[in-house]
Amino acid sequence: MAVTACQGLGFVVSLIGIAGIIAATCMDQWSTQDLYNNPVTAVFNYQGLWRSCVRESSGFTECRGYFTLLGLPAMLQAVRALMIVGIVLGAIGLLVSIFALKCIRIGSMEDSAKANMTLTSGIMFIVSGLCAIAGVSVFANMLVTNFWMSTANMYTGMGGMVQTVQTRYTFGAALFVGWVAGGLTLIGGVMMCIACRGLAPEETNYKAVSYHASGHSVAYKPGGFKASTGFGSNTKNKKIYDGGARTEDEVQSYPSKHDYV
C-alpha cells in the first residue's frame, strides 16, 4: 500500500513539475526590467526564451520573436536546449510511469516489469528536473553577470546634462517557476525510484539444504549465486532475489547514468 502511495505521489508530483517546466519554458518573463533606477517608467521590458516584450503604460503590449537562430547568444541556445530536453525526458517519463503504476493493470505484466518501468521513469524525471534546474540556473547566472556589467556603466554621458539610462534586467517569474518545477520533478523522480525498490517481488527464502555428493561434502544454497554470477537453480523459471539485489539481465535492462549525458 505504501509503495502504491509512494509511486502515485511520485507520479503526481512529477506531473505537476513537468507542467511547470513547460509553463516556465513558454513564459515571457524570464528576465524583467529592473525598476530600481526608474520606478516610474511608462515602458516596461521583459524577455523570454523565445521572444521579448514591451508593455506600455497605455495597456498596449508588443512582443517580438527571436527570428534569428545564429544571432542568438550561445547561452540562450543552451538554456533552450536544456529546457526542451527536460520537457522531452519528462514527457517520456510520464508515459512510461503511467504503464508502471501499480494501480493500473495492463495484461499480465509482472511486478518486475513494473519495477523496471518505475525505475526508468524515475531516472527520467530526475534527469528532467536537473535539466530544468540547470537551464534556469544558467540563465540566472547570465542575468547576474549582465546586471553587474550594466551597473558598472549604468550612465553613459552624451555630453552636458544629457544621459542615456541603460536598461538592466533582473529575475523574472519564469525563473522561480522553473526552479520550483525542476525541484518537484526531481523529487517525483526520487519517489519513483524509492517506489521501484518496493515494487520488486520479495525474495523467496529457501532454507539451506545439504547435498552430499560423492567424495565431496559441499553445502549449496539454490540460487544463492544467481545475483552475482547469473547462474543457479531456478527450476520454476521465477526470478530469485538475494537481499534486493538484481540479476545481471535486469541490471543491464536499466538505463545507466551514462545513457543521459
Epitope: 526590467q33 521579448s52 506600455e56 497605455s58 495597456g59 544629457v162 539610462v165
Partner: antibody
C-alpha cells in the same frame, strides 16, 4: 466611435473641492491606461495624472500630488479626478485622454473648464 | 523629471514650403527593449483638444496626412511638414512618453508667412 466626455468643471473658491468625470463610450475603459491633462488659459499642455487599466498603478504630477486623486469605475465606463485644496494656479481646461500605441494620447475629450477664484 | 525643450517658440512659413520644428529631451527616450523612441507629437488648433500626429518619434497616426513626418532618436527629434497647408496653422507640442511625469514641450506656434 470612441468618445470621451468630461463634466464637473465650474467656478470654485481657493481651498475648495471639485470632482471631474469623464464618460467613455465606443470602447471598454478597463482595457486602457487613462490620463488627465490640463491647459491653463493661453498656456501649454501639462500632464496631471495617470491610472493603469487595472488601477494598480497611479501617477501624479508633482504640482498636484497629495491634493488630486484619480480613480475609475469600470462598470460605469467612467474616469474621475477628485480635486481638493484647489489653488488659483489650478485654473485650466481639464482633458481626459486615452493612450494606446507608443503611449500616445490618441483620443481626447473636449475638456471641462475649472476656474479657481475668490 | 525629463525636460522637453522645443525650438523655435514660433515659426512663420510660406504656403507650400517646408516647416521644421525641433524638440530636445534632457534624457534619452530610446527604449532598448524594442529600439523605439517614446516621443509623441501633437497638433492643437484654437478651441480644440490636441490631436495626435506622431508616436514612437516617427510613426504617423492613422488619418494623418503624409506631409507630416517625425525623425530623430535618443534626445534630438524633429517634426517636419513637407509642404505647409493653410489648415496646418496650429500650436505643435512634443511629449516625453517614456518616463513619468509625462512632460510636454512648451509648444511651437506655426503661422503662415
Amino acid at each position: 466611435e470612441v468618445q470621451l466626455v468630461e463634466s464637473g468643471g465650474g467656478l470654485v473658491q481657493p481651498g475648495g473641492s471639485l470632482r471631474l468625470s469623464c464618460a467613455a463610450s465606443g470602447f471598454t475603459l478597463n482595457n486602457f491606461g487613462m490620463h488627465w491633462v490640463r491647459q491653463a488659459p493661453g498656456k501649454g499642455l501639462e500632464w496631471v495624472s495617470y491610472i493603469s487599466s487595472g488601477s494598480g498603478t497611479i501617477y501624479y504630477a508633482d504640482s498636484v500630488k497629495g491634493r488630486f486623486t484619480i480613480s475609475r469605475d469600470n462598470p460605469k465606463n467612467s474616469l474621475y479626478l477628485q480635486m481638493n485644496s484647489l489653488r488659483a494656479e489650478d485654473t485650466a481646461v481639464y482633458y481626459c485622454a486615452r493612450a494606446y500605441y507608443g503611449n500616445g494620447f490618441s483620443f481626447w475629450g473636449q475638456g471641462t473648464l475649472v476656474t479657481v477664484s475668490s | 523629471d525629463i525636460v522637453m525643450t522645443q525650438s523655435p517658440d514660433s515659426l512663420a512659413v510660406s504656403l507650400g514650403e517646408r516647416a521644421t520644428i525641433n524638440c530636445k529631451s534632457s534624457q534619452s527616450l530610446l527604449n532598448s527593449g524594442n529600439q523605439k523612441n517614446y516621443l509623441t507629437w501633437y497638433q492643437q488648433k484654437p478651441g480644440q483638444p490636441p490631436k495626435l500626429l506622431i508616436y514612437w518619434a516617427s510613426t504617423r497616426e492613422s488619418g494623418v496626412p503624409d506631409r507630416f513626418s517625425g525623425s530623430g532618436s535618443g534626445t534630438d527629434f524633429t517634426l517636419t511638414i513637407s509642404s505647409l497647408q493653410a489648415e496646418d496653422v496650429a500650436v505643435y507640442y512634443c511629449q516625453n512618453v517614456y518616463s513619468y511625469p509625462l512632460t510636454f514641450g512648451q509648444g511651437t506656434k506655426l503661422e503662415i508667412k
